[in-house]
């Protein structure tokens, strides 16, 4: 399964789209910045097998897709860019799912690392809570956009490490 190469390209496209989605100057939102506690250790490709790493990537993309598929998100972003971004994420999810199935069939390794999946879910819960507390304000969404770009960058780096392992 040659996931990392195709997935990295998709991730880069998603990052570019997310960069283009900015609607207000982030410099008007400096006071709204927040530490969401990105679980960076979950993006350390050395600590688990390829299948488990792929399942963490899948969870990250899935949660990002869910976050940007809400009604509140639709109201916050320019529709055509949001649709392109969501389509890119959806394509990545399909690639990841196919890859996990292939890896499990070939390697027989466990499908996921429960602790890592839970860490990613809690991270997105913190993001959702922040948006709720900030009443989905434009600045709150701008802060979240930067944070998701950061997390997507981390997952891109994990993919690079996976490629070196292959």
């Amino acid at each position: 399964c040659d996931l990392p190469q195709t997935h990295s390209l998709g991730n880069r496209r998603a990052l570019i789209l997310l960069a283009q989605m900015g609607r207000i100057s982030p410099f008007s939102c400096l006071k709204d910045r927040h530490d969401f506690g990105l679980p960076q250790e979950e993006f350390d490709g050395n600590q688990f097998q390829k299948t488990q790493a792929i399942s963490v990537l899948h969870e990250m993309i899935q949660q990002t897709f869910n976050l940007f598929s809400t009604e509140d998100s639709s109201a916050a972003w320019e529709q055509s860019l949001l649709e392109k971004f969501s389509t890119e994420l959806y394509q990545q999810l399909n690639n990841l799912e196919a890859c996990v199935i292939q890896e499990v069939w070939m390697e027989g390794t466990p499908l996921m690392n429960e602790d890592s999946i839970l860490a990613v879910r809690k991270y997105f819960q913190r993001i959702t809570l922040y948006l709720t507390e900030k009443k989905y304000s434009p600045c709150a969404w701008e802060v979240v956009r930067a944070e998701i770009m950061r997390s997507l960058s981390f997952s891109t780096n994990l993919q690079k490490r996976l490629r070196r392992k292959d």
Partner: antibody
Framework: QVQLQESGTVLARPGASVKMSCKAS????????MHWVKQRPGQGLEWIGV????????TYNQKFKDKAKLTAVTSANTAYMELSSLTNEDSAVYFC?????????????WGQGTTVTVSS | DIVLTQSPASLAVSLGQRATISCRAS??????????MHWYQQKPGQTPKLLIY???NLESGVPARFSGSGSGTDFTLNIHPVEEEDAATYYC?????????FGSGTKLEIK
């Protein structure tokens, strides 16, 4: 690899204007903010402002609002800074620097600097 | 504007010893879990190089002998053990609010 190539040394008269360039390569130019920083000889660093090449959005240090104008041409992957009404105080090295880590606003890659000398 | 006061202005440290540089902000640069203070190294005739971001995060490729700490208004850069190649001027920079500002710099000399 990421590179920021700045224009060469500039000698200008007081009251004149100068426009310096910063050509970016090795990364997606339109998706990173670009900062500009001033350093006077033997002195510290001063943040001038920042531009987002993707849409031309700019934010300035109020101190430089009437002094510096930041622009970018995406087709050329180049950012520009124009300094107007030059005085001796504007004699300095000017760096373009790429924004890093999104909204942490640190600077990872720096151009080699453009030296501006204002003299009559 | 937030003023960053660095001390000392210069220091001389013996090879292998510890160098400690302080940066004090006139107003807190920490919000909601992050401290928006960063450290750079500038060698003569060179461009500044990012060492530490968000007060304590070591930039990729920077030797582990560099470390940063602090929150609110008081921040510290430590270098231990100091090596010859560490002779440079060190600047702190905040990104807590506009305008971003730099400290006046600390010149490190190796004895």
């Amino acid at each position: 690899q990421v590179q920021l190539q700045e224009s060469g040394t500039v000698l200008a008269r007081p009251g004149a204007s100068v426009k310096m360039s910063c050509k970016a390569s090795g990364y997606s130019f339109t998706t990173y903010w670009m900062h500009w920083v001033k350093q006077r000889p033997g002195q510290g660093l001063e943040w001038i402002g920042v531009i987002y090449p993707g849409n031309g959005d700019t934010t300035y240090n109020q101190k430089f609002k009437d002094k510096a104008k930041l622009t970018a041409v995406t087709s050329a992957n180049t950012a520009y800074m124009e300094l107007s009404s030059l005085t001796n105080e504007d004699s300095a090295v000017y760096f373009c620097t790429r924004n890093y880590k999104y909204d942490y606003y640190t600077m990872d890659y720096w151009g080699q600097g453009t030296t501006v000398t204002v003299s009559s | 504007d937030i003023v960053l006061t660095q001390s000392p202005a210069s220091l001389a440290v013996s090879l292998g010893q510890r160098a400690t540089i302080s940066c004090r902000a006139s107003k807190s640069v920490s919000t909601s879990g992050h401290s928006y203070m960063h450290w750079y190294q500038q060698k003569p005739g060179q461009t500044p190089k990012l060492l530490i971001y968000l007060a304590s995060n070591l930039e990729s490729g920077v030797p582990a002998r560099f470390s940063g700490s602090g929150s609110g208004t008081d921040f510290t850069l430590n270098i231990h053990p100091v090596e010859e190649e560490d002779a440079a001027t060190y600047y702190c920079q905040h990104s807590g609010e506009l305008p971003f500002t730099f400290g006046s710099g600390t010149k490190l000399e190796i004895k």
